[in-house]
């Protein structure tokens, strides 16, 4: 999944309801799996920010070696730096672990730009601010990498939380979360609350800032407002979902919904941006430009290159439209919509501005591998990865950045027919199977 702007490579609503509103379903909360309610020990266990990823503290080996690990729902390997690297403050030292077992097998993961390679083994792993368990998990010990680790990011490895189908070198390598569920009584569910800064942070502030929460084994009610709406996981490889409609400030992009999911749509905490297929991106930008036409911005801004700066505190949020994605619902012909604000899709960038300036990058970008709902989307919502029931839940995040006029929203239900037709069926040739968005 590390294509384009994958992190390790670096980067009140208008609009009529769609058709008739359906009657409210029975409250979904009685049906949720896993432990309910409070997970105090896991709240605020993530640090970081959207531009460099969100990481959780983990320990590996015996005695335990503490590392910060990027939380990535767009890949399926647990991989950690295991050799000195200029950007790493620390790394996994296998020779110091009495519980390390060598699998005598290498792994090589190339990206569009960059790569990592390493040696496979297993060791004991735990999450200090997570469930009170220790599991034996597969670990890729990264011995060589290029454009993978990020200078100053403060993480030393990656926790791939997606399914075995996209694990490297092949799907026989059990991902960490599968091992966790198999070896413990922890329910097969986790949830993420990523809290974007909303304003530029200097390096001191960034290191001290709380980034959010990864709740393992359930849902924490304190992390969201309103109700959770669920969309089916279409296929268990990436966390693939189906988008059925896209609106900019309530205006339908009016595209064949297959275009929105060409060649897939995934939820990926390891990607910074909201990435859209070329045709969709072009239509969306045209619509966003039209909605914000009282100002004109350079082409480089819409390409995610140039930064637009305003005097501190004067960012004109109101001129930028909201973006709504309608997702397939759990009930036939029913959808719901998630709506993000410019506070999510204009990403604050530190270092370039003076203290008197607020500078932003446009964090919607073009993709050749389908829609990627990255941190830009996730920072608006509490996202539940309900693997047990093959569904992903969205609710308004208690920590999302907004203003006094608009807030991110999750709303439904809406009547939407023929949603199954919105999914793109990737041709299953030998070649395409080998190339699932990796090389």
């Amino acid at each position: 999944t590390h294509l384009g702007i994958r992190l390790p490579l670096r980067s009140g609503l208008a609009g009529p309801p769609l058709g008739l509103r359906l009657p409210r379903e029975t409250d979904e909360e009685s049906e949720e799996p896993g432990r309910r309610g409070s997970f105090v020990e896991m709240v605020d266990n993530l640090r970081g920010k959207s531009g460099q990823g969100y990481y959780v503290e983990m320990t590996v080996g015996s005695p335990p070696q503490t590392l910060n690990i990027l939380v990535d729902t767009g890949s399926s390997n647990f991989a950690v730096g295991a050799a000195p690297h200029p950007f790493l403050h620390r790394y996994y030292q296998r020779q110091l672990s009495s519980t390390y077992r060598d699998l005598r097998k290498g792994v090589y993961v190339p990206y569009t730009q960059g790569k990592w390679e390493g040696e496979l083994g297993t060791d004991l792993v735990s999450i200090p601010h997570g469930p009170n368990v220790t599991v034996r998990a597969n670990i890729a010990a990264i011995t060589e990498s290029d454009k993978f680790f990020i200078n100053g990011s403060n993480w030393e490895g990656i926790l791939g939380l997606a399914y075995a189908e996209i694990a490297r070198p092949d799907d026989s390598l059990e991902p960490f979360f599968d091992s966790l569920v198999k070896q413990t009584h922890i329910p097969n569910i986790f949830s993420l609350q990523l809290c974007g800064a909303g304003f530029p942070l200097n390096q001191t502030e960034a290191l001290a800032s709380v980034g959010g929460s990864m709740i393992i084994g359930g849902i924490d009610h304190s992390l969201y407002t309103g109700r959770l709406w669920y969309t089916p996981i279409r296929r268990e490889w990436y966390y693939e979902v189906i988008i059925v409609r896209v609106e900019i400030n309530g205006q339908d992009l009016k595209m064949d919904c297959k275009e929105y999911n060409y060649d897939k749509s995934i939820v990926d905490s390891g990607t910074t941006n909201l990435r859209l297929p070329k045709k969709v991106f072009e239509a969306a930008v045209k619509s966003i430009k039209a909605a914000s036409s009282t100002e004109k911005f350079p082409d480089g801004f819409w390409l995610g290159e140039q930064l637009v700066c305003w005097q501190a505190g004067t960012t004109p949020w109101n001129i930028f439209p909201v973006i709504s994605l309608y997702l397939m619902g759990e009930v036939t012909n029913q959808s719901f919509r998630i709506t993000i604000l410019p506070q999510q899709y204009l990403r604050p960038v530190e270092d370039v501005a003076t203290s008197q300036d607020d500078c932003y990058k446009f964090a919607v970008s073009q993709s050749s591998t389908g829609t990627v709902m990255g941190a830009v989307i996730m920072e608006g919502f509490y996202v539940v990865f309900d693997r047990a029931r093959k569904r992903i839940g969205f609710a308004v995040s208690a920590c999302h950045v907004h203003d006094e006029f608009r807030t991110a929203a999750v709303e439904g239900p809406f009547v939407t027919a023929d949603m199954e037709d919105c999914g793109y069926n990737i041709p299953q040739t030998d070649e395409s199977t080998l190339m699932t968005g990796r090389a």
């Epitope: 036409s293 009282t294 100002e295 004109k296 911005f297 350079p298 082409d299 480089g300 801004f301 290159e305 140039q306 930064l307 637009v308 700066c309 270092d351 370039v352 501005a353 300036d357 500078c359």
Partner: antibody, heavy 120, light 108 residues
Framework: QLQLQESGPGLVKPSETLSLTCTVS??????????WGWIRQPPGKGLEWIGS???????YYNPSFKSRVTISVDTSKNQFSLKLSSVTAADTAVYYC????????????WGRGTLVTVSS | EIVLTQSPATLSLSPGERATLSCRAS??????LAWYQQKPGQAPRLLIY???NRATGIPARFSGSGSGTDFTLTISSLEPEDFAVYYC??????????FGGGTKVEIK
Amino acid sequence: QLQLQESGPGLVKPSETLSLTCTVSGGSTSSSSYYWGWIRQPPGKGLEWIGSIYRSGSTYYNPSFKSRVTISVDTSKNQFSLKLSSVTAADTAVYYCARVGHGISYFDLWGRGTLVTVSS
Amino acid sequence: EIVLTQSPATLSLSPGERATLSCRASQSVSSYLAWYQQKPGQAPRLLIYDASNRATGIPARFSGSGSGTDFTLTISSLEPEDFAVYYCQQSLTWPPRTFGGGTKVEIK
């Protein structure tokens, strides 16, 4: 051919407001393709951006001027203006108006400039 | 804040010689960099934009190169009218705002 011409008093007293106008000929301030900007150059020194304006009246200012600067546009007269309040001797400079073109990222056409001296 | 540092401050050359002017950014500005020429008593004139594109009417002896943090303006063979002050300007941060301190090209 598009031309820009600055006009306004060459001498302003300290604490008063400096007011300059840029008249655009051979083109239009209502074009959607350009911003319009003011840059100044103190004697013997480098260039300093003051601010820019779009046809809609949307403005961007150099934060170092804080709240002293106001730029406005009058598309009916094909003019845009600069007001800089509470001036001091440090504001003595040649003031240029310019068109922001080439993807609204560079100053591609400039006026000839006008020297404004702040002195009592 | 992105700072542009130009070097040398002064370049003393003779007509017909090759001039190489440097502009270094304190952090990457991609290719969002321009060069201007300013003759005494005149307004600046845009020479190069987006690091390497010549503006309308600019002679071919002027060329720009570089990306990221290091940029070069080259005048392949100095003409008498080329003796002037040259400024670089970045527009990675928009609106365009930051100029370098200038390099004076004078007759040796």
